[in-house]
Interface confidence: low
């Protein structure tokens, strides 16, 4: 593992950088006096922008609104007004620009109708916004159009009467397929979920929804639920959260064949003010919130089994506000198995974890190098790092940016933090750590702006500031030496940063807009850094790097979820373009099964730095509900089950007493006689 | 070391205003926040505001809003308290301090660490 | 608001004594939001222990904060001479932030 810098290490300036930058550097001042602004990346690789800005006057009886549309095709470094391709028609930001999935091109506005329309209206490209046509919608739209991920034709919308709409050729014609929904969903293959209101309201429903479904875009449905509270979608599982029968209680069930056959989930029933949460999930499994009675602030993470059913209790006191309220739990995508998030300790202290191998174990965040501990620190010289994430961002708290990590630039983690017992509220500093999150390092001193250029071979970023700013800062060796470029004379009130998704780009654009007595003038400035990183790289500028390495000489280092991997990586010192088509090189080995590989199996759970499975003390000697498709089931476990995604082979497999958990099927909403076909007459 | 100084006594008149101010040395002045809290003769400490010498925000309490502006200057790394429309029940010891939780709450409050020596402004005809 | 009511209003004790200052608040207050402060006469306050519980940093360890909910104690275990002043509660767990009247722990 590559380990931080010496703080006195000698940052070489890069030769010219001031000349190269300020070539590549375009700005565009936006010729209108609009309140906001947003921008959309249209296509991948594509190098179109389209920006929109809003400019709204709220009068005594209607609101006069005026929007302007400007598109960029080299990454925005130059912009044309293409207003009159929208007839300069006013677009309602709320449904912001609905862009196409993948690089189809397609982009739908909607634009605000006066008040005694039919219904509303839309501006449609298929051609990277190049063009629009207007079309007029026999509804008014209740939320943003969605694309069907499998074929962008396809789009689905609510009407403010509760209509679902569907349009099988990209917004040209419409056809209502169902009243009374409450909520819709594409699923695989063009499957639309929804769920629908029975005799009220989906408010006064709620807990007596129907979840329905259709295959074929409305054509026939099928109801595969009933007593439903709510539903979504994670990686291949469908859940559904049931009322119970008895009381006013729900339970999670989860179908993995698009609701054909059910399985109750083992996970604990929630009453009416809790809350279930799908954290993340992918094809192997899912992590799950589920709620604390009473308005605790917190709950318990549990990760599942290959099917989604059996739940093995994964972290307490998971810091998760409200419904719809704010959890800092953070997928790290630049290393597989890594997450962070934080819990509210006993003391009502927020602190930081991390979970290196899917949600099995979580820690400590480690110390950074040469750092202090701050006043949260009852030892001044043990403490750990505490990221800010969505819930400090929501307290207000000086932290302009979330975690970052992308896929590409493998092990880089950025995010803002403080070093102490606990997150606390001074300012906070922005910490890096080039290998997953196990080391950290002090980045730059104060809350800053960040955003990973060239799959990691620059970092860019901004100080955060309520004054005018006009300094951009930027690193090539992974944010151990950092230049400064004073990108115009005139400072900006700075906004954002834009660089296109993916992290592949070389161009950021700093948008800001600059205010005189009376108008404000929004002004985006774009970098390009090719000419910085002159070369493409080569072979000698890339060295191998073992991910999860912990124990060098143990030849299980570097095992997670059963296999381990190698990586090339840009060396530090190499100022050298990886480029568009850069593609992470890695090795992976399957590694000896450990108990490490297991999780526990429903029933069971593992203590604090423990590696065996103990069984739940409060589920001995309980009868408990489970269903199996449906069915009843008697599980039988010896306690461990092997962890989704888990490749190991040979080595150990736990062994004990397999015992009979004796469950019984208690939920009707798996009645098969609640399941009936319908056709669309 | 780490201290807070602040500016002299004042007599004022009632209906004037006064400005305290409080300098802070030996730590970096935007990273907490600045309180603060007065006294009357023979009385117990009263909350007056706070402010973040981060970004500005204030937090005032609640009978002195309109009366009370706090501000910083993070040049000078020096806070300032302006009362205005003084009464007689304004004469007090007023304190400044530091303020870890800058006027906000993340779930834990540190207390007020380190104290000014306090200003004494006395509101008479 | 949140008041806080300290009592006793006044302590006499001995230099050697154990001291008991209870601080109680007219509703539930987070631990992690309530700090004491010590003041002697024509001093600023001085910081003793945050989060109900912790000694800041400098503060010797015979002073102690303990409690919960709307409940809060500072004991001092051995009473030093430079220990009688004028001792207040403050919390911040709802705006607008408030301090108790004070406990006058005096000498006997």
């Known amino acids: 593992r590559r380990g931080a810098p010496a703080e006195d290490q000698d940052c070489g300036r890069l030769p010219d950088f001031i000349a190269k930058l300020t070539n590549n550097t375009h700005q565009h001042v936006f010729d209108d006096l609009s309140g906001s602004v947003s921008l959309s990346w249209v296509g991948d690789s594509t190098g179109v922008i389209l920006v929109l800005t809003t400019f709204q006057v709220p009068l005594v009886i209607v609101s006069f609104g005026q929007s302007k549309l400007y598109r960029s095709e080299d990454y925005g470094k130059n912009f044309k007004d293409i207003t009159n391709l929208i007839n300069n028609t006013f677009i309602r930001t709320e449904f912001g620009m609905a862009i196409g999935p993948e690089n189809s091109g397609k982009v739908i506005l909607t634009a605000e109708v006066s008040g005694g329309s039919r219904g509303g209206r839309v501006f449609r490209s298929s051609d990277f916004a190049k063009n629009f046509v207007q079309t007029d919608l026999p509804f008014h739209p209740l939320t943003q159009m969605m694309y069907s991920p499998q074929n962008s034709d396809y789009l689905l919308a609510l009407s403010t009467e509760n209509g679902l709409w569907v349009s099988k050729n990209f917004g040209e014609k419409w056809e209502e397929i169902h009243k009374a929904v409450c909520l819709a969903k594409w699923g695989p293959n063009n499957i639309i979920f929804f769920t629908t209101h029975v005799n009220g309201s989906c408010k006064a429903d709620l807990g007596a929804l129907e979840l329905w479904r259709t295959s074929d875009l409305g054509k026939t449905f099928k109801t595969i639920g009933v007593k439903i509270y709510s539903f979504g979608l994670g990686g291949r599982f469908l859940f559904a959260s049931v009322m119970a029968d008895k009381d006013t209680t729900r339970r999670i069930h989860v179908s993995t064949d698009q609701g054909d056959t059910w399985s109750m989930a083992q996970l604990p029933s929630v009453g009416q003010e809790q809350f279930y949460s799908i954290l993340a999930a992918n094809e192997d499994m899912v992590f799950m919130h589920v709620d604390e009675p009473g308005d605790t602030g917190f709950g318990t993470i549990f990760t599942s089994d290959d099917r989604g059913i059996v739940y093995s209790k994964s972290l307490d006191r998971h810091l998760y506000t409200t419904t719809g309220g704010e959890t800092d739990f953070t997928n790290v995508t630049s290393l597989r198995g890594v997450y962070i998030t934080s819990t509210l300790s006993e003391d009502n202290s927020i602190q930081s974890m991390i979970t290196f191998d899917q949600g099995g174990r979580w820690e400590h965040l480690r110390k950074p190098e040469n750092s202090k501990c701050d006043a949260t620190a009852k030892n001044k010289n043990e403490c750990s790092l505490h990221i800010h994430a969505s819930y400090s961002i929501s307290q207000k708290l000086n932290v302009p940016m979330a975690p970052l990590s992308e896929p590409n630039a493998v092990g880089i983690v950025i995010a803002h933090g403080s070093v102490g017992d606990a997150i606390s509220v001074m300012v906070p500093d922005v910490y890096i750590s080039d290998d997953g999150g196990y080391s950290w390092a002090k980045m730059l001193e104060g809350p800053h702006y960040y955003t990973i250029l060239d799959s990691g071979g620059i970092i860019v970023a901004i100080e955060h500031s309520n004054r005018p700013i006009n300094v951009i800062k930027f690193s090539t060796d992974e944010g151990q030496c950092w230049q400064s470029y004073v990108f115009t004379q005139e400072p900006i009130y700075f906004t954002g940063l834009a660089s296109e998704p993916g992290a592949r780009s070389m161009n950021i654009s700093i948008w800001g807009f600059t205010e005189s007595f009376i108008t404000r003038q929004w002004v985006s400035y774009t970098v390009d850094f090719k000419d910085i990183l002159e070369r493409n790289c080569e072979e000698d500028d890339y060295t191998t790097w073992l991910a999860h390495s912990t124990d060098p000489g143990d030849y299980k280092d570097g095992c997670i979820l059963g296999y381990k991997e190698q990586f090339l990586r840009l060396r530090k010192s190499s100022v050298c373009q990886n480029g568009r088509d850069y593609v992470v090189a890695k090795q992976p080995s399957v590694c000896p099964c450990s108990l490490e590989d297991f999780l526990c199996d429903f029933g069971y759970f593992r203590p604090e730095n423990a590696s065996e499975c103990v069984e739940q003390p409060e589920l001995k000697g309980h009868e408990l509900e489970f269903c199996l498709y449906g069915k009843e089931e008697h599980l039988t476990t010896n306690g461990y089950r092997k962890i989704p995604g888990d490749k190991c082979q040979g080595g150990m497999n736990p062994a004990r007493e397999v015992k009979d958990l004796k469950k019984k099927c208690t939920s009707n909403f798996l009645n098969p006689t609640k399941q009936n076909s319908k056709s669309n007459s | 070391q780490v201290q807070l100084v602040q500016s002299g006594a004042e007599v004022k008149k009632p209906g004037a205003s006064v400005k305290v101010s409080c300098k802070a040395s030996?730590?970096?002045?935007?990273?907490?926040?600045i309180s603060w809290v007065r006294q009357a003769p023979g009385q117990g400490l009263e909350w007056m505001g706070s402010?973040?010498?981060?970004?500005?925000?204030?937090n005032y309490a609640q009978k002195l809003q309109g009366r009370v502006t706090m501000t910083t200057d993070t040049s000078t790394s020096t806070a300032y308290m302006e009362l205005r429309s003084l009464r007689s029940d304004d004469t007090a010891v007023y304190y400044c301090?530091?303020?870890?939780?800058?006027?906000?709450?993340?779930?834990?409050?540190?207390?007020?660490?380190?104290w000014g020596q306090g200003t004494t402004v006395t509101v008479s005809s | 608001e949140i008041v806080l009511t300290q009592s006793p209003g006044t302590l006499s004790l001995s230099p050697g004594e154990r001291a008991t200052l209870s601080c109680r608040a007219s509703?539930?207050?987070?631990?992690?939001?309530l700090a004491w402060y010590q003041q002697k006469p024509g001093q600023a306050p001085r910081l003793l222990i945050y989060g109900a519980s912790s000694r800041a940093t400098g503060i010797p360890d015979r002073f102690s904060g303990s409690g919960s909910g709307t409940d809060f104690t500072l004991t001092i275990s051995r009473l030093e001479p430079e220990d009688f002043a004028v001792y207040y509660c403050?919390?911040?767990?709802?705006?607008?932030?408030?301090f108790g009247g004070g406990t006058k722990v005096e000498i006997k």
């Open positions: 403050d919390q911040l767990g709802s705006s607008p932030r408030t």
């Open positions: 402010i973040s010498a981060y970004n500005g925000n204030t």
């Open positions: 301090a530091r303020d870890p939780s800058g006027g906000t709450t993340l779930h834990y409050y540190y207390g007020m660490d380190v």
């Open positions: 509703q539930s207050v987070r631990s992690s939001y």
């Open positions: 030996g730590y970096t002045f935007t990273s907490y926040g």
